[in-house]
Interface confidence: low
Amino acid sequence: ADSFSLNDALAGSGNPNPQGYPGAWGNQPGAGGYPGAAYPGAYPGQAPPGAYPGQAPPGAYPGQAPPSAYPGPTAPGAYPGPTAPGAYPGQPAPGAFPGQPGAPGAYPQCSGGYPAAGPYGVPAGPLTVPYDLPLPGGVMPRMLITIMGTVKPNANRIVLDFRRGNDVAFHFNPRFNENNRRVIVCNTKQDNNWGKEERQSAFPFESGKPFKIQVLVEADHFKVAVNDAHLLQYNHRMKNLREISQLGISGDITLTSANHAMI
């Protein structure tokens, strides 16, 4: 998998001294812009959320209903770059915004390095799934959340829910078999209703194989990298980041570690 450059990411995020962070990899091609518009705006091809057909009952945990339970919107965002092997996750590639699903060139190549910031949270070791990782004080720009584990054989789904009370600010849901296709669905649950889905056709997870998910919080979006490759970006729909105080991790995985660090 391509990795991304932490230096580039920092440079692209307005960090005045990106060179202060070592790069773990060589100079790979920089990330290009992502075609297509990112949220806000309408996502083409979306299903109207109106009655959200098949929606899980109020209070139901997302991902437990059949795949049709989530409204079917579209445009995927591009996400953060990965991290250095064994280190803490890298930052997202600097590109512009997310590409449309499957759009050529939508997923930039990146190279990355990781900061020497220490993680907070859970020690490495098997964790019970579903697992709730507290995010004291909420999330904030430059916070990096790293989740490591292994996908179970014959997996159906993985779910990450960045929660704000009963709401889900960022629902990241790789689905291994939605109508015989693999897709990543991102969404927000607000006022007990799911919004417009953003769907991503790039699918870096494999049943039975280990994974590393890194989520970098930026001022206006979450960036996600998987196995040190930039995957997608999801624009904030809830602005009160400091109130997003819990990360729920569930699905068909064994969880080795989950932590967060400021980079």
């Epitope: 949220y39 309408a42 109020p58």
Partner: antibody, heavy 117, light 110 residues
Framework: EVQLVESGGSLVKPGGSLRLSCAAS????????MNWVRQAPGKGLEWISN????????YYADFVKGRFTISRDNAKNSLYLQMNSLRAEDTAVYYC??????????WGRGTLVTVSS | QSVLTQPASVSGSPGQSITISCAGT?????????VAWYQQHPGKAPKLMIY???YRPSGVSNRFSGSKSGNTASLTISGLQAEDEADYYC??????????FGGGTKLEIK
Amino acid sequence: EVQLVESGGSLVKPGGSLRLSCAASGFTFSNYNMNWVRQAPGKGLEWISNIDGSSRYIYYADFVKGRFTISRDNAKNSLYLQMNSLRAEDTAVYYCVRSYYGGMDVWGRGTLVTVSS
Amino acid sequence: QSVLTQPASVSGSPGQSITISCAGTSSDVGGYYNVAWYQQHPGKAPKLMIYYDSYRPSGVSNRFSGSKSGNTASLTISGLQAEDEADYYCSSSTGYSTRVFGGGTKLEIK
């Protein structure tokens, strides 16, 4: 049937206090953020306050901060608005409203609050 | 004074289409917040017609549509009918749960 019914509106003197109540039925009350919205006679709508399902996150419009307090009792399926230091300009119909993904989909019929000496 | 600016009134004949604008700023309408539209008949409570910029709740006629461009949102009503005569209000978030309304637009059917 999903329903919201406000009560507690009355005539009150300037500087006085009043507590409005809203009884919710037909839906799982604790799952929804709730709002108070008001409308002065012949005027437009004004958002007052919002409270989430667990009463953890509460927001107010600037013009009522420090004077009005929103609260809820999920066990009683009830929403409340405690109004203190009332002014003539607070005269309005007060609506209890359910949040719906950035909109407000269920409205009560409203209760009239008149502030006058 | 309302934060969002709407025309005080618009008019149209039965069968025609009309558009009501709602001008805001990058901090409300132009942000990635949701715009909603409400219809209010005299003496009645408002009714949600459009939410999340352009989506209709179930039960709302498809003659009503919403859109947003830059810092301005719009409500379009096609095939005007007598029962559409009412006041229309736009609303936008300025933060996760804070909201502001427009001053309202009176729609007159000629």
